[in-house]
């Protein structure tokens, strides 16, 4: 979690002088409970934004919006901890609102934004905004949040992002795979336009089951530039195993930009139909 | 234009089902999160199921959880809510509408909801 462009913050706006801090996501308020305080945020919206950096660089960033409600406590109102939380690392960064002046009653509802929290694709956040100070430790809680969940880099629009392109999002491989006889499967692909190497992952399993009856692995060496974007294709042979049908292709491109974590793609190969006719009972019983 | 044009609803008895249908035109339907809300005769309107741009998430109200089922289809521009085990409470008008930015939140939509259809009635009565 990061901020982008922290030198051009801004949160003031007109009837109001505000400066935009580093936080600790522990307001002094919390440990000094003060007697009065303003009430929650209202209205706390969230979009996916995109923005680039001085270098030129893309990246999504979460835009939070929220205004205040018409109340006589925005007279205590000090300012606002914004707070992003990422969910699968418990990784939280914050940033504080402070307000240099007192906030008038004006003849519209008073709103704020800010838009520099970057974003990691496919990752999800709780988002916080909490009015300051804080409430004491049984008043009513004046924070408004919402968990915020970011396109992956197969959407369109998140494709073109630079923590998308590094990880490869612009190779589209198109795989096929094709079952051939005596226990063979014909993969292939649109190679990069890079000299990388390439990994073939397969994984097989039996029909309607999730446990894996087969896995191998194909190295494919670096293309020379004149086969850029070329088809590779290669043939795999399977396990002679009754059942075990099911067959995940999946391909593992090692870029510069992502070496062994990019985007890796994957194809499916389903079991065969089958019939729906019942088999015929026997006539007889055997004994043994 | 935006337009959402939902269908399905009628006239049920409590415990059968119905399958509701919305169908989008105007904008890139698969870069955007969808959702269902509802409003019960003279109530205000209740957020009822979300599901996102790939269908990767999909999120229910406490009130319908186990018994409806949210799914889109991308190719079809189309947004689907099966509604099983109905009950006299689910009676309402029943809205399709598109989140107003790109992203996915949980339990109602991130920013106020841009776009909605005219809507389809659900009347769940023995």
């Known amino acids: 979690l990061r901020l982008l462009d922290h030198r051009a913050l801004v949160c003031s706006q007109p009837g109001l002088n505000c400066t935009v801090k580093n936080s600790t996501c522990l307001d002094d308020s919390w440990i000094h409970p003060r007697n009065l305080t303003p009430s929650s945020p209202k209205d706390l919206q969230i979009q996916l934004h995109f923005a680039h950096t001085q270098q030129g660089d893309l990246f999504p960033v979460a835009h939070i919006e929220w205004t205040l409600q018409t109340d006589a406590s925005i007279l205590y109102l000090e300012g606002a901890e914004l707070s992003v939380l990422q969910l699968n690392t418990n990784e939280r960064l914050c940033v504080r609102f402070e307000f240099l002046s007192k906030l008038r009653h004006h003849h519209r509802r008073w709103r704020f934004t800010f838009s520099h929290f970057v974003v990691d694709p496919d990752q999800e956040y709780e988002v916080t905004v909490h009015h300051l100070p804080k409430p004491i430790p049984d008043g009513d809680p004046n924070h408004q949040s919402k968990n915020f969940l970011v396109p992956d880099c197969e959407h369109a629009r998140m494709k073109v992002t630079t923590p998308c392109m590094s990880s490869g999002s612009l190779w589209d491989p198109n795989i096929t795979v094709e079952t051939l006889e005596a226990h063979q499967l014909r993969v292939s692909f649109t190679l990069w336009n890079e000299s990388t190497h390439y990994q073939i992952l397969l994984t097989s399993f039996p029909h309607m089951e999730n446990h894996s009856c087969f896995e191998h692995m194909h190295h494919i060496p670096a293309p020379r530039p004149e086969e850029f974007h070329q088809r590779s294709n290669v043939t795999l042979t399977l396990r002679n195993l009754k059942g075990c049908c099911r067959h995940q292709v999946q391909i593992q491109p090692f870029f510069s930009s992502c070496l062994n974590d990019c985007l890796r793609h994957s194809a499916t190969v389903s079991c065969p139909e089958m019939p729906d006719t019942p088999e015929p009972i026997p006539d007889y019983m055997p004994l043994w | 234009e935006v337009q959402l044009v939902e269908s399905g609803g009628g006239l049920v008895q409590p415990g059968r089902s119905l399958r509701l249908s919305c169908a989008a035109s105007g904008f890139t339907f698969d870069d955007y999160a969808m959702h269902w809300v509802r409003q019960a005769p003279g109530k205000g309107l209740e957020w009822v199921s979300g599901?996102?741009?790939?269908?990767?998430?999909?999120d229910y109200a406490d009130s319908v959880k186990g018994r409806f089922t949210i799914s889109r289809d991308n190719a079809k521009n189309s947004l689907y809510l099966q509604m099983n085990s109905l009950r006299v409470e689910d009676t309402a008008l029943y809205y399709c509408?598109?989140?107003?930015?790109?992203?996915?939140?949980?339990?109602?939509?991130?920013?106020?909801?841009?776009?909605r259809g005219q809507g389809t009635l659900v009347t769940v009565s023995s």
């Open positions: 509408v598109k989140e107003t930015g790109l992203g996915y939140c949980s339990g109602g939509g991130c920013s106020d909801f841009d776009y």
């Open positions: 599901i996102s741009w790939n269908s990767g998430r999909r």
